[in-house]
Interface confidence: medium
Protein backbone atom coordinates (compact mmCIF):
# COMPACT_ATOMS: atom_id res chain seq x y z
CA UNK A 1 0.00 0.00 0.00
CA UNK A 2 1.08 3.79 0.63
CA UNK A 3 2.09 5.34 3.39
CA UNK A 4 -0.52 8.34 3.75
CA UNK A 5 0.14 11.10 7.55
CA UNK A 6 -2.22 10.42 10.30
CA UNK A 7 -4.82 12.83 9.88
CA UNK A 8 -5.24 14.11 13.13
CA UNK A 9 -8.70 14.42 13.74
CA UNK A 10 -9.14 10.38 13.25
CA UNK A 11 -11.20 8.73 16.02
CA UNK A 12 -9.18 6.81 18.79
CA UNK A 13 -8.93 3.11 17.90
CA UNK A 14 -7.87 0.74 20.85
CA UNK A 15 -4.78 -1.06 20.49
CA UNK A 16 -6.26 -4.60 21.15
CA UNK A 17 -8.41 -3.99 18.55
CA UNK A 18 -6.40 -2.17 15.90
CA UNK A 19 -6.38 -2.67 13.06
CA UNK A 20 -9.09 -5.35 12.79
CA UNK A 21 -12.46 -3.50 13.96
CA UNK A 22 -12.71 -0.05 12.14
CA UNK A 23 -15.60 1.99 12.02
CA UNK A 24 -17.62 2.30 9.36
CA UNK A 25 -20.41 5.04 8.26
CA UNK A 26 -23.37 3.36 6.44
CA UNK A 27 -24.40 6.03 4.87
CA UNK A 28 -23.53 4.97 1.66
CA UNK A 29 -22.11 7.68 -1.11
CA UNK A 30 -23.02 6.41 -4.24
CA UNK A 31 -20.27 7.59 -7.09
CA UNK A 32 -22.30 6.31 -10.08
CA UNK A 33 -24.79 9.41 -10.29
CA UNK A 34 -23.83 9.79 -14.07
CA UNK A 35 -24.08 5.83 -15.29
CA UNK A 36 -27.08 5.01 -17.04
CA UNK A 37 -27.95 1.39 -15.89
CA UNK A 38 -30.83 1.30 -18.30
CA UNK A 39 -28.73 1.04 -21.17
CA UNK A 40 -26.88 -2.32 -19.99
CA UNK A 41 -30.08 -3.55 -18.12
CA UNK A 42 -31.30 -6.04 -21.35
CA UNK A 43 -27.55 -7.27 -22.27
CA UNK A 44 -28.29 -10.72 -20.51
CA UNK A 45 -30.80 -11.35 -23.16
CA UNK A 46 -29.25 -9.49 -26.06
CA UNK A 47 -25.80 -11.43 -25.25
CA UNK A 48 -24.34 -14.25 -27.82
CA UNK A 49 -23.63 -15.74 -24.16
CA UNK A 50 -27.00 -15.24 -22.86
CA UNK A 51 -27.47 -15.70 -19.19
CA UNK A 52 -30.81 -15.67 -16.99
CA UNK A 53 -30.42 -13.83 -12.80
CA UNK A 54 -30.89 -15.33 -9.93
CA UNK A 55 -31.58 -13.87 -6.73
CA UNK A 56 -29.35 -13.96 -3.97
CA UNK A 57 -30.70 -13.72 -0.64
CA UNK A 58 -29.10 -13.26 3.04
CA UNK A 59 -30.46 -11.56 5.89
CA UNK A 60 -27.32 -11.89 8.00
CA UNK A 61 -25.17 -10.02 4.89
CA UNK A 62 -25.40 -6.77 3.42
CA UNK A 63 -26.40 -5.90 0.88
CA UNK A 64 -28.79 -9.00 1.73
CA UNK A 65 -30.01 -9.45 -2.14
CA UNK A 66 -27.62 -10.44 -4.50
CA UNK A 67 -27.84 -11.02 -8.50
CA UNK A 68 -25.93 -13.83 -9.99
CA UNK A 69 -25.24 -14.35 -13.17
CA UNK A 70 -26.31 -17.73 -15.13
CA UNK A 71 -25.32 -19.05 -18.17
CA UNK A 72 -28.73 -20.35 -20.39
CA UNK A 73 -26.36 -22.36 -22.61
CA UNK A 74 -23.04 -24.46 -23.03
CA UNK A 75 -22.30 -22.97 -26.44
CA UNK A 76 -22.73 -19.49 -27.42
CA UNK A 77 -25.57 -18.00 -29.79
CA UNK A 78 -24.62 -18.31 -33.92
CA UNK A 79 -25.82 -15.84 -36.23
CA UNK A 80 -28.66 -17.97 -37.15
CA UNK A 81 -29.66 -17.66 -33.35
CA UNK A 82 -28.70 -21.62 -33.32
CA UNK A 83 -26.78 -22.66 -30.08
CA UNK A 84 -23.10 -23.23 -31.41
CA UNK A 85 -21.23 -25.61 -29.62
CA UNK A 86 -17.56 -25.38 -31.23
CA UNK A 87 -17.92 -21.96 -28.65
CA UNK A 88 -18.68 -21.88 -24.68
CA UNK A 89 -20.93 -19.67 -22.76
CA UNK A 90 -18.90 -18.79 -19.46
CA UNK A 91 -19.05 -17.00 -16.29
CA UNK A 92 -17.53 -14.03 -15.73
CA UNK A 93 -16.86 -13.67 -11.89
CA UNK A 94 -16.03 -11.36 -9.53
CA UNK A 95 -14.83 -10.90 -6.01
CA UNK A 96 -16.62 -8.53 -4.09
CA UNK A 97 -16.56 -7.23 -0.36
CA UNK A 98 -19.75 -7.49 1.44
CA UNK A 99 -20.69 -6.94 5.25
CA UNK A 100 -21.43 -10.20 7.50
CA UNK A 101 -23.45 -9.56 10.66
CA UNK A 102 -21.48 -10.86 13.37
CA UNK A 103 -22.03 -11.82 16.24
CA UNK A 104 -25.49 -13.34 13.68
CA UNK A 105 -28.62 -10.85 14.20
CA UNK A 106 -26.35 -7.80 15.52
CA UNK A 107 -27.83 -4.71 14.01
CA UNK A 108 -24.56 -2.50 14.39
CA UNK A 109 -21.82 -5.25 14.11
CA UNK A 110 -20.60 -6.76 11.01
CA UNK A 111 -17.50 -8.56 9.25
CA UNK A 112 -15.75 -8.25 6.08
CA UNK A 113 -16.51 -11.16 3.68
CA UNK A 114 -15.29 -11.50 0.13
CA UNK A 115 -17.32 -13.51 -1.84
CA UNK A 116 -17.36 -14.78 -5.33
CA UNK A 117 -20.30 -13.71 -7.51
CA UNK A 118 -21.09 -14.49 -11.45
CA UNK A 119 -21.53 -10.75 -13.11
CA UNK A 120 -22.75 -12.16 -16.55
CA UNK A 121 -21.48 -14.40 -19.40
CA UNK A 122 -18.83 -14.39 -22.69
CA UNK A 123 -18.30 -16.07 -25.36
CA UNK A 124 -15.14 -18.07 -25.61
CA UNK A 125 -13.33 -20.13 -27.92
CA UNK A 126 -12.28 -23.48 -26.29
CA UNK A 127 -9.44 -24.63 -25.23
CA UNK A 128 -8.52 -27.67 -27.11
CA UNK A 129 -6.14 -30.65 -25.63
CA UNK A 130 -4.87 -32.71 -28.21
CA UNK A 131 -3.84 -35.57 -27.35
CA UNK A 132 -0.48 -36.94 -27.88
CA UNK B 1 -35.88 -6.87 4.49
CA UNK B 2 -36.57 -9.21 6.98
CA UNK B 3 -37.28 -8.94 11.09
CA UNK B 4 -34.54 -10.87 12.62
CA UNK B 5 -34.57 -11.22 16.59
CA UNK B 6 -31.45 -9.43 18.13
CA UNK B 7 -28.78 -11.10 19.76
CA UNK B 8 -28.15 -10.34 23.10
CA UNK B 9 -24.41 -10.97 23.07
CA UNK B 10 -24.28 -7.04 20.17
CA UNK B 11 -21.87 -4.66 21.24
CA UNK B 12 -24.04 -1.58 22.59
CA UNK B 13 -25.12 0.96 20.34
CA UNK B 14 -25.17 4.90 21.21
CA UNK B 15 -28.51 6.14 19.32
CA UNK B 16 -27.36 8.77 18.51
CA UNK B 17 -25.14 7.17 15.88
CA UNK B 18 -27.28 4.15 15.15
CA UNK B 19 -27.43 2.33 12.61
CA UNK B 20 -25.04 5.20 10.96
CA UNK B 21 -21.67 3.76 12.34
CA UNK B 22 -21.21 0.26 12.83
CA UNK B 23 -18.27 -1.60 13.73
CA UNK B 24 -16.78 -3.83 11.22
CA UNK B 25 -13.98 -6.51 11.39
CA UNK B 26 -11.62 -5.80 8.93
CA UNK B 27 -10.05 -9.71 9.03
CA UNK B 28 -11.37 -10.96 5.93
CA UNK B 29 -13.29 -14.34 5.55
CA UNK B 30 -13.12 -15.27 2.51
CA UNK B 31 -16.26 -17.85 1.60
CA UNK B 32 -14.54 -18.79 -2.08
CA UNK B 33 -12.42 -21.33 -0.98
CA UNK B 34 -13.92 -24.36 -2.81
CA UNK B 35 -14.48 -22.26 -6.25
CA UNK B 36 -11.01 -22.88 -6.73
CA UNK B 37 -10.84 -24.56 -10.75
CA UNK B 38 -7.01 -25.80 -11.41
CA UNK B 39 -6.62 -23.92 -14.59
CA UNK B 40 -6.43 -20.08 -14.98
CA UNK B 41 -9.40 -18.96 -17.53
CA UNK B 42 -7.65 -16.11 -19.21
CA UNK B 43 -11.61 -15.19 -20.95
CA UNK B 44 -10.30 -12.01 -21.30
CA UNK B 45 -8.10 -12.93 -24.33
CA UNK B 46 -10.29 -15.74 -25.55
CA UNK B 47 -13.64 -14.33 -25.24
CA UNK B 48 -15.07 -12.74 -29.34
CA UNK B 49 -15.17 -10.00 -26.91
CA UNK B 50 -12.08 -9.55 -25.85
CA UNK B 51 -10.66 -6.91 -23.31
CA UNK B 52 -7.60 -5.09 -21.57
CA UNK B 53 -7.36 -4.93 -17.72
CA UNK B 54 -6.74 -1.68 -16.22
CA UNK B 55 -5.59 -1.06 -13.07
CA UNK B 56 -7.11 1.58 -10.75
CA UNK B 57 -5.34 2.70 -7.84
CA UNK B 58 -6.87 4.84 -5.05
CA UNK B 59 -4.69 4.59 -1.39
CA UNK B 60 -8.21 6.24 0.44
CA UNK B 61 -9.63 3.19 -0.61
CA UNK B 62 -10.01 -0.22 0.61
CA UNK B 63 -9.38 -2.37 -1.83
CA UNK B 64 -6.77 0.32 -2.93
CA UNK B 65 -6.08 -1.69 -6.25
CA UNK B 66 -9.09 -2.29 -8.23
CA UNK B 67 -8.75 -3.63 -12.08
CA UNK B 68 -11.17 -2.76 -14.67
CA UNK B 69 -11.99 -3.78 -17.78
CA UNK B 70 -11.94 -2.32 -21.30
CA UNK B 71 -13.48 -3.84 -24.52
CA UNK B 72 -10.83 -3.80 -27.14
CA UNK B 73 -13.03 -3.88 -29.77
CA UNK B 74 -16.39 -1.32 -30.89
CA UNK B 75 -17.27 -4.85 -32.84
CA UNK B 76 -16.68 -8.86 -31.83
CA UNK B 77 -14.04 -11.32 -33.32
CA UNK B 78 -15.63 -13.54 -35.69
CA UNK B 79 -14.70 -17.27 -36.31
CA UNK B 80 -12.09 -16.00 -38.98
CA UNK B 81 -10.55 -13.81 -36.27
CA UNK B 82 -11.51 -10.51 -37.69
CA UNK B 83 -13.62 -7.58 -35.81
CA UNK B 84 -17.37 -7.80 -36.86
CA UNK B 85 -19.38 -4.45 -36.41
CA UNK B 86 -22.53 -6.38 -37.29
CA UNK B 87 -21.94 -7.02 -33.51
CA UNK B 88 -20.83 -5.09 -30.53
CA UNK B 89 -18.44 -5.69 -27.56
CA UNK B 90 -20.16 -4.04 -24.27
CA UNK B 91 -18.34 -3.94 -21.11
CA UNK B 92 -20.82 -6.24 -18.00
CA UNK B 93 -20.54 -3.49 -15.31
CA UNK B 94 -21.35 -4.22 -11.88
CA UNK B 95 -21.69 -2.12 -8.22
CA UNK B 96 -19.48 -3.13 -5.74
CA UNK B 97 -19.32 -2.10 -2.13
CA UNK B 98 -15.51 -0.26 -1.29
CA UNK B 99 -14.87 1.30 2.19
CA UNK B 100 -13.82 5.12 1.72
CA UNK B 101 -11.46 6.38 4.34
CA UNK B 102 -13.22 9.33 6.19
CA UNK B 103 -12.21 11.44 7.71
CA UNK B 104 -9.11 10.74 4.88
CA UNK B 105 -5.77 9.94 6.08
CA UNK B 106 -7.31 7.90 9.21
CA UNK B 107 -6.91 4.64 9.04
CA UNK B 108 -9.70 3.32 11.42
CA UNK B 109 -12.23 4.85 9.88
CA UNK B 110 -14.40 4.65 6.58
CA UNK B 111 -17.58 5.03 5.00
CA UNK B 112 -18.99 2.72 2.40
CA UNK B 113 -19.06 3.35 -1.06
CA UNK B 114 -21.25 2.40 -4.03
CA UNK B 115 -18.88 2.08 -7.48
CA UNK B 116 -19.22 1.32 -10.73
CA UNK B 117 -16.93 -1.32 -12.20
CA UNK B 118 -16.52 -3.48 -16.03
CA UNK B 119 -15.92 -6.91 -14.88
CA UNK B 120 -15.63 -7.65 -18.53
CA UNK B 121 -17.22 -7.61 -22.14
CA UNK B 122 -19.71 -9.59 -23.66
CA UNK B 123 -20.91 -9.65 -27.48
CA UNK B 124 -24.40 -8.24 -28.12
CA UNK B 125 -26.78 -7.67 -30.93
CA UNK B 126 -27.19 -4.28 -31.81
CA UNK B 127 -30.34 -2.46 -31.33
CA UNK B 128 -31.25 -1.17 -35.00
CA UNK B 129 -33.02 2.18 -35.24
CA UNK B 130 -35.68 2.37 -37.62
CA UNK B 131 -35.89 5.34 -39.39
CA UNK B 132 -40.05 5.59 -39.68
CA UNK C 1 15.18 -6.10 -29.59
CA UNK C 2 13.83 -4.48 -26.17
CA UNK C 3 16.38 -3.52 -23.75
CA UNK C 4 16.77 -1.82 -20.24
CA UNK C 5 19.98 -0.62 -18.87
CA UNK C 6 20.57 1.16 -16.26
CA UNK C 7 23.22 3.09 -14.62
CA UNK C 8 26.65 2.13 -12.88
CA UNK C 9 27.20 0.54 -9.11
CA UNK C 10 27.22 2.87 -6.39
CA UNK C 11 28.91 3.32 -3.22
CA UNK C 12 26.80 5.92 -0.43
CA UNK C 13 27.40 7.04 2.93
CA UNK C 14 24.57 6.91 5.44
CA UNK C 15 22.10 9.46 5.08
CA UNK C 16 22.64 10.06 1.76
CA UNK C 17 20.59 9.78 -1.73
CA UNK C 18 20.88 7.65 -4.37
CA UNK C 19 19.72 8.06 -7.99
CA UNK C 20 19.48 5.48 -10.30
CA UNK C 21 18.50 5.65 -14.19
CA UNK C 22 17.27 3.03 -16.35
CA UNK C 23 16.91 3.32 -20.83
CA UNK C 24 14.66 1.83 -22.47
CA UNK C 25 14.93 1.13 -26.06
CA UNK C 26 13.72 -1.47 -28.24
CA UNK C 27 9.86 -0.55 -27.40
CA UNK C 28 7.19 2.48 -26.91
CA UNK C 29 8.29 4.08 -23.51
CA UNK C 30 4.95 5.13 -22.75
CA UNK C 31 2.67 2.20 -23.13
CA UNK C 32 4.62 0.50 -19.96
CA UNK C 33 4.65 1.11 -16.36
CA UNK C 34 8.55 1.32 -15.39
CA UNK C 35 8.49 -0.69 -11.81
CA UNK C 36 11.49 -0.49 -9.56
CA UNK C 37 12.43 -3.51 -7.77
CA UNK C 38 15.11 -4.07 -4.84
CA UNK C 39 17.10 -7.15 -3.58
CA UNK C 40 19.54 -7.38 -0.97
CA UNK C 41 22.23 -9.17 -0.54
CA UNK C 42 21.03 -13.32 -0.52
CA UNK C 43 17.27 -12.05 -0.11
CA UNK C 44 14.17 -12.18 -2.23
CA UNK C 45 12.74 -9.47 -4.32
CA UNK C 46 10.59 -6.33 -3.06
CA UNK C 47 9.01 -4.06 -5.23
CA UNK C 48 9.60 -0.30 -4.66
CA UNK C 49 6.61 1.07 -6.65
CA UNK C 50 6.46 2.16 -10.70
CA UNK C 51 5.68 4.91 -12.38
CA UNK C 52 3.05 5.78 -15.77
CA UNK C 53 5.72 7.42 -18.44
CA UNK C 54 2.63 8.53 -20.19
CA UNK C 55 1.41 10.78 -17.31
CA UNK C 56 4.01 10.50 -14.93
CA UNK C 57 1.74 9.35 -12.07
CA UNK C 58 3.60 6.94 -9.40
CA UNK C 59 2.88 4.02 -6.75
CA UNK C 60 4.72 3.23 -3.87
CA UNK C 61 5.21 0.33 -1.49
CA UNK C 62 4.83 2.04 1.51
CA UNK C 63 7.90 0.38 3.14
CA UNK C 64 9.66 3.12 1.61
CA UNK C 65 7.70 6.05 3.92
CA UNK C 66 7.86 8.50 1.17
CA UNK C 67 11.85 8.18 0.90
CA UNK C 68 11.47 7.34 -3.19
CA UNK C 69 11.28 9.12 -5.95
CA UNK C 70 10.37 8.08 -9.29
CA UNK C 71 10.93 10.18 -12.33
CA UNK C 72 10.99 9.55 -15.82
CA UNK C 73 11.81 12.10 -19.40
CA UNK C 74 10.16 10.56 -22.38
CA UNK C 75 12.41 12.27 -24.64
CA UNK C 76 15.03 10.13 -23.61
CA UNK C 77 13.14 7.00 -22.67
CA UNK C 78 14.34 7.17 -19.21
CA UNK C 79 12.95 6.42 -15.70
CA UNK C 80 14.76 7.47 -12.65
CA UNK C 81 14.37 6.01 -8.88
CA UNK C 82 15.98 7.80 -5.79
CA UNK C 83 15.72 6.95 -2.66
CA UNK C 84 16.83 9.01 0.24
CA UNK C 85 17.91 9.02 3.99
CA UNK C 86 20.09 5.76 2.67
CA UNK C 87 20.58 3.20 5.42
CA UNK C 88 22.76 0.21 5.90
CA UNK C 89 19.74 -2.24 5.09
CA UNK C 90 19.00 -0.48 2.20
CA UNK C 91 22.63 -2.10 0.27
CA UNK C 92 21.02 -3.90 -2.48
CA UNK C 93 21.03 -4.63 -6.67
CA UNK C 94 17.78 -2.27 -7.61
CA UNK C 95 16.83 -3.44 -10.51
CA UNK C 96 13.96 -1.81 -13.06
CA UNK C 97 11.28 -4.01 -14.88
CA UNK C 98 8.83 -2.88 -17.64
CA UNK C 99 4.94 -4.06 -17.28
CA UNK C 100 2.45 -3.36 -19.46
CA UNK C 101 -0.39 -0.60 -18.64
CA UNK C 102 -3.50 -2.90 -20.16
CA UNK C 103 -2.47 -5.59 -17.28
CA UNK C 104 -2.61 -7.93 -15.89
CA UNK C 105 1.02 -6.37 -15.16
CA UNK C 106 3.75 -9.07 -15.08
CA UNK C 107 7.57 -7.97 -15.59
CA UNK C 108 8.81 -9.34 -19.04
CA UNK C 109 11.89 -7.70 -19.35
CA UNK C 110 14.12 -6.57 -16.57
CA UNK C 111 17.19 -4.25 -16.02
CA UNK C 112 20.50 -5.75 -15.49
CA UNK C 113 20.76 -3.94 -12.04
CA UNK C 114 22.49 -1.55 -9.99
CA UNK C 115 24.54 -2.35 -6.95
CA UNK C 116 24.30 0.43 -4.75
CA UNK C 117 26.41 0.18 -1.42
CA UNK C 118 25.53 2.05 1.65
CA UNK C 119 28.55 2.26 4.23
CA UNK C 120 30.05 4.43 6.16
CA UNK D 1 -0.66 -6.52 1.12
CA UNK D 2 -0.83 -9.76 -0.44
CA UNK D 3 1.47 -12.32 1.11
CA UNK D 4 2.83 -14.95 -0.75
CA UNK D 5 3.95 -18.03 0.51
CA UNK D 6 6.55 -20.38 -1.25
CA UNK D 7 7.07 -24.25 -0.56
CA UNK D 8 9.55 -25.31 -0.66
CA UNK D 9 12.64 -23.04 0.69
CA UNK D 10 14.72 -25.71 -1.12
CA UNK D 11 14.29 -28.58 -3.51
CA UNK D 12 16.80 -30.92 -4.83
CA UNK D 13 15.87 -33.22 -7.59
CA UNK D 14 17.49 -35.61 -10.03
CA UNK D 15 18.32 -34.75 -13.80
CA UNK D 16 15.10 -35.77 -15.82
CA UNK D 17 12.61 -36.40 -13.10
CA UNK D 18 10.09 -33.71 -11.83
CA UNK D 19 10.06 -30.52 -10.01
CA UNK D 20 7.11 -29.16 -8.12
CA UNK D 21 7.01 -25.73 -6.59
CA UNK D 22 4.15 -24.20 -4.59
CA UNK D 23 3.09 -20.78 -3.88
CA UNK D 24 0.53 -19.76 -1.32
CA UNK D 25 -1.45 -16.54 -1.63
CA UNK D 26 -3.35 -14.82 1.61
CA UNK D 27 -6.02 -14.12 -0.45
CA UNK D 28 -7.53 -14.67 -4.01
CA UNK D 29 -5.99 -13.54 -7.01
CA UNK D 30 -8.21 -14.54 -9.86
CA UNK D 31 -9.86 -11.74 -11.67
CA UNK D 32 -12.75 -12.32 -14.07
CA UNK D 33 -10.82 -15.94 -14.69
CA UNK D 34 -7.32 -14.47 -14.73
CA UNK D 35 -5.06 -15.59 -12.42
CA UNK D 36 -2.97 -12.64 -12.20
CA UNK D 37 0.20 -14.73 -10.82
CA UNK D 38 3.29 -15.07 -12.68
CA UNK D 39 6.82 -17.22 -11.73
CA UNK D 40 10.19 -15.81 -12.15
CA UNK D 41 13.52 -17.77 -12.45
CA UNK D 42 16.64 -15.80 -11.15
CA UNK D 43 20.54 -17.48 -11.71
CA UNK D 44 23.29 -16.18 -9.58
CA UNK D 45 24.07 -12.99 -10.73
CA UNK D 46 21.81 -12.18 -13.23
CA UNK D 47 18.27 -9.97 -13.10
CA UNK D 48 15.13 -12.46 -12.52
CA UNK D 49 13.62 -13.83 -16.13
CA UNK D 50 9.79 -14.14 -16.81
CA UNK D 51 8.87 -17.76 -17.22
CA UNK D 52 5.04 -18.41 -16.78
CA UNK D 53 2.65 -15.07 -16.44
CA UNK D 54 -1.21 -15.36 -15.88
CA UNK D 55 -0.73 -18.18 -13.79
CA UNK D 56 -0.42 -20.84 -16.96
CA UNK D 57 1.03 -18.86 -20.05
CA UNK D 58 4.48 -19.71 -21.07
CA UNK D 59 6.56 -16.95 -21.97
CA UNK D 60 8.07 -16.73 -25.67
CA UNK D 61 11.07 -18.57 -25.68
CA UNK D 62 11.11 -20.55 -22.13
CA UNK D 63 11.43 -24.00 -23.15
CA UNK D 64 7.70 -26.60 -22.52
CA UNK D 65 9.15 -28.67 -20.21
CA UNK D 66 7.79 -25.64 -17.79
CA UNK D 67 4.25 -25.28 -16.88
CA UNK D 68 2.13 -23.51 -14.20
CA UNK D 69 -1.50 -24.26 -13.00
CA UNK D 70 -3.59 -22.75 -10.38
CA UNK D 71 -6.41 -20.32 -9.21
CA UNK D 72 -7.51 -18.31 -6.58
CA UNK D 73 -5.07 -18.73 -3.92
CA UNK D 74 -3.17 -21.87 -5.38
CA UNK D 75 -0.55 -22.14 -7.65
CA UNK D 76 1.97 -24.45 -8.91
CA UNK D 77 5.25 -24.46 -10.55
CA UNK D 78 6.11 -27.24 -12.77
CA UNK D 79 9.12 -28.57 -14.62
CA UNK D 80 8.56 -32.12 -16.12
CA UNK D 81 12.44 -32.75 -16.69
CA UNK D 82 15.06 -31.71 -14.73
CA UNK D 83 17.95 -30.38 -16.95
CA UNK D 84 21.22 -29.46 -15.35
CA UNK D 85 20.24 -25.39 -16.24
CA UNK D 86 17.66 -25.17 -14.32
CA UNK D 87 19.31 -24.72 -11.62
CA UNK D 88 18.02 -21.57 -10.13
CA UNK D 89 15.71 -19.69 -7.90
CA UNK D 90 12.57 -19.38 -8.40
CA UNK D 91 10.25 -16.83 -7.61
CA UNK D 92 6.21 -16.22 -7.47
CA UNK D 93 4.54 -12.60 -7.70
CA UNK D 94 0.96 -11.93 -7.60
CA UNK D 95 -0.45 -8.47 -9.35
CA UNK D 96 -3.65 -8.52 -8.09
CA UNK D 97 -3.04 -5.73 -5.56
CA UNK D 98 0.56 -3.77 -5.62
CA UNK D 99 2.83 -6.43 -6.20
CA UNK D 100 4.60 -8.83 -3.54
CA UNK D 101 6.98 -12.01 -4.73
CA UNK D 102 7.34 -15.04 -2.86
CA UNK D 103 10.01 -15.73 -0.69
CA UNK D 104 11.75 -17.72 -3.44
CA UNK D 105 12.44 -21.54 -3.90
CA UNK D 106 16.18 -22.71 -3.93
CA UNK D 107 16.37 -25.59 -6.62
CA UNK D 108 19.28 -27.91 -6.81
CA UNK D 109 20.27 -31.00 -8.29
CA UNK D 110 20.21 -34.34 -6.79
Known amino acids: GITIPRNPGCPNSEDKNFPRTVMVNLNIHNRNTNTNPKRSSDYYNRSTSPWNLHRNEDPERYPSVIWEAKCRHLGCINADGNVDYHMNSVPIQQEILVLRREPPHCPNSFRLEKILVSVGCTCVTPIVHHVA | GITIPRNPGCPNSEDKNFPRTVMVNLNIHNRNTNTNPKRSSDYYNRSTSPWNLHRNEDPERYPSVIWEAKCRHLGCINADGNVDYHMNSVPIQQEILVLRREPPHCPNSFRLEKILVSVGCTCVTPIVHHVA | QVQLVQSGAEVKKPGASVKVSCKASGFTFTDYYMNWVRQAPGQGLEWMGD????????IFNQNFRGRVTMTRDTSISTAYMELSRLRSDDTAVYYC?????????????WGQGTLVTVSS | DIVMTQSPDSLAVSLGERATINCKAS??????????MHWYQQKPGQPPKLLIY???NLEAGVPDRFSGSGSGTDFTLTISSLQAEDVAVYYCQQTMEYPTFGGGTKLEIK
Open chain 4, 27 to 36: QSVSFAGTGL
Open chain 4, 54 to 56: RAS
Open chain 3, 97 to 109: ARSILTGPFYFDY
Open chain 3, 51 to 58: INPKNGGT
